[in-house]
Amino acid sequence: AITEAREEAKPYPLFPGPLPGSLQTDHTSLLSLPHTSGYQPALMFSPTQPGRPYTGNVAIPRVTSAGSKLLPPLAFKHTVGHIILSEHKDVKFNCSISVPNIYQDTTISWWKDGKELLGAHHAITQFYPDDEVTAIIASFSITSVQRSDNGSYICKMKINNEEIVSDPIYIEVQGLPHFTKQPESMNVTRNTAFNLTCQAVGPPEPVNIFWVQNSSRVNEQPEKSPSVLTVPGLTEMAVFSCEAHNDKGLTVSKGVQINIKAIPSPPTEVSIHNSTAHSILISWVPGFDGYSPFRNCSVQVKEVDPLSNGSVMIFNTSASPHMYQIKQLQALANYSIGVSCMNEIGWSAVSPWILASTTEGAPSVAPLNVTVFLNESRDNVDIRWMKPLTKRQAGELVGYRISHVWQSAGISKELLEEVGQNNSRAQISVQVHNATCTVRIAAVTKGGVGPFSDPVKIFIPAHGWVDHAPSSTPAPGNADPVLII
């Protein structure tokens, strides 16, 4: 792989063969010595002769006990300072140092942009022992470099709690422009200006931008990245992209569709889910939103009746969920229902109309003339009433519901009885004596239970006290009838 090197100082030669710290253009090991260790900083062993020192970040050794002679300061030797290469190439670089043999347990570590490189990196440390010093060469290789490998690499060595740091080696990976911001799809109002943004980076810089609309270039002269394209307005959908150019070539962004907002399509599949006497639950499938979110919907209801005036009831509702309960309808009636929805541009057409019917309703009036009296010989309460006058919409009478509440000594119990539609009288068992029984009656149709009649109270004496006088529903104006024994 061809690798460019730019540096201010040449490394000092120490050994024959490949220079420690010099730029590698092949990808073989520097040396094949027995004392090598891959992927880990390694211990120093035998002595060797020192190379010429570098006066940067140095450690000053103490006087040796043996010969009382001063050892030279320790420093990493100069190495290549800047490596430029293309993406996906391989690279190898190194740093070297000569260490007197008096120092034990010396380790070299690699750091990138201030963080130690741990784990499965291709770092190899090799040792060249001599009588007094050991030359250490730490090499670092990267296969198929990526932009993320860009940065400043250094070697560090700790000796006697002192840290020696090498000169940085700057790795610059060059390649095609890389997009940091691409244009985004948009939905825009017809003939309204909007902006698109495109940004790409190298290295190498500079990066120039061309805009493309529907496969045709928009700008004849490139703009330096980042670039903002102002489109004065569109009348129909268009596809935009941008081209980023640098010395390595060009990269094309994704194509983005710019849609023109329009009124929605009408809803489809209006369905009836549930009908009661006075309400209908509907749902619908929204039509196409016209590239603009639905805001709300309108449910339109017409009574299908030759005698009705054909007026339309309109119920506004939120666009989601696609469901609405239409209320306040007549019982046992037929309706035509349509749905329309709107976005910021306007209302859709109305969906296809569907027919729906309400069910029969509950009675709207209570039974009349309710009379209650005690039949003590049988321990029964006799109840009589008159059938209410119900409207056609209430449906067919199926029976009556009788509520009887028994109260005595602070205790109260409500019981319910059902009787058939042909009855206008009923008998209920006395539940308890020396108590008040309160009776109410409601008419029942398939549509439900109607209102209860006004309460009628009768006192049930202790067993053996005979009194047959009835209680009855009061005339209008009287509030709470009580039979006084």
């Epitope: 321990d379 005595s408 000594a409 205790i411 109260s412 119990k413 006395v430 308890v432 004596h433 202790a462």
Partner: antibody
Framework: QVQLQQWGAGLLKPSETLSLTCAVY????????WSWLRQPPGKGLEWIGE???????NYNPSLKSRVTISVDTSKNQFSLKLSSVTAADTAVYYC????????????WGRGTLVTVSS | EIVLTQSPATLSLSPGERATLSCRAS??????LAWYQQKPGQAPRLLIY???NRATGIPARFSGSGSGTDFTLTISSLEPEDFAVYYC?????????FGQGTRLEIK
């Protein structure tokens, strides 16, 4: 087969609150009134109060100021709380079922002896 | 409130004999009266309701009678398992109430 299973603290000090729970297993909870009764040692039975599945309650007037009966229909359980107990509240406490309209107790729990002593 | 008085307090009989237990109400209870049997360490068991109706599963030797204020529980021929305490109970007026009980013991 419907069963009533009851539990709660068996030993209380005066002025504490008695608390018992009764669970209904294997049968319907609605359509009945659910009662608590008690029987002091060697004496007769006394009705304390009742609750329906819908939560409507009735209490014996002599105990009303101290009694609370509650229901948890999701668990088919009902509970009794009797506050400010004295030695006179020492008894076997029973839970029982009654048809809503005839008020005869046709199903009973096994009873819990509650002793109030300082 | 209706007070129920049972008599006798204790009744000593032998198996095979006829037992007659009495319950008197302080006011008329109509026929809204029941009888319960209770054995030591057990909960009461419903025998008779509405004065004369046998509850489900109760043997025919148990019968009830009476109306108003005087009620009777009769066991036609005593079996060993019938020796227990018997309570009458009224639901005619609220609050409902029980008698103090009759102990039926083996002679």
């Amino acid at each position: 087969q419907v069963q009533l299973q009851q539990w709660g603290a068996g030993l209380l000090k005066p002025s504490e609150t008695l608390s018992l729970t009764c669970a209904v297993y294997g049968g319907s909870f609605s359509g009945y009134y659910w009662s608590w009764l008690r029987q002091p040692p060697g004496k007769g039975l006394e009705w304390i109060g009742e609750i329906s599945h819908s939560g409507s309650t009735n209490y014996n007037p002599s105990l009303k100021s101290r009694v609370t009966i509650s229901v948890d229909t999701s668990k088919n359980q009902f509970s009794l709380k009797l506050s400010s107990v004295t030695a006179a509240d020492t008894a076997v406490y029973y839970c029982a079922r009654a048809l809503s309209r005839y008020w005869y107790f046709d199903l009973w729990g096994r009873g819990t002896l509650v002793t109030v002593s300082s | 409130e209706i007070v129920l008085t049972q008599s006798p307090a204790t009744l000593s009989l032998s198996p095979g004999e006829r037992a007659t237990l009495s319950c008197r109400a302080s006011q008329s209870a109509s026929n809204y009266l029941a009888w319960y049997q209770q054995k030591p360490g057990q909960a009461p068991r419903l025998l008779i309701y509405d004065a004369s109706n046998r509850a489900t599963g109760i043997p025919a030797r148990f019968s009830g009678s009476g109306s108003g204020t005087d009620f009777t529980l009769t066991i036609s021929s005593l079996e060993p398992e019938d020796f227990a305490v018997y309570y009458c109970y009224q639901r005619s007026q609220w609050p409902i109430s029980f008698g103090q009980g009759t102990r039926l013991e083996i002679k």
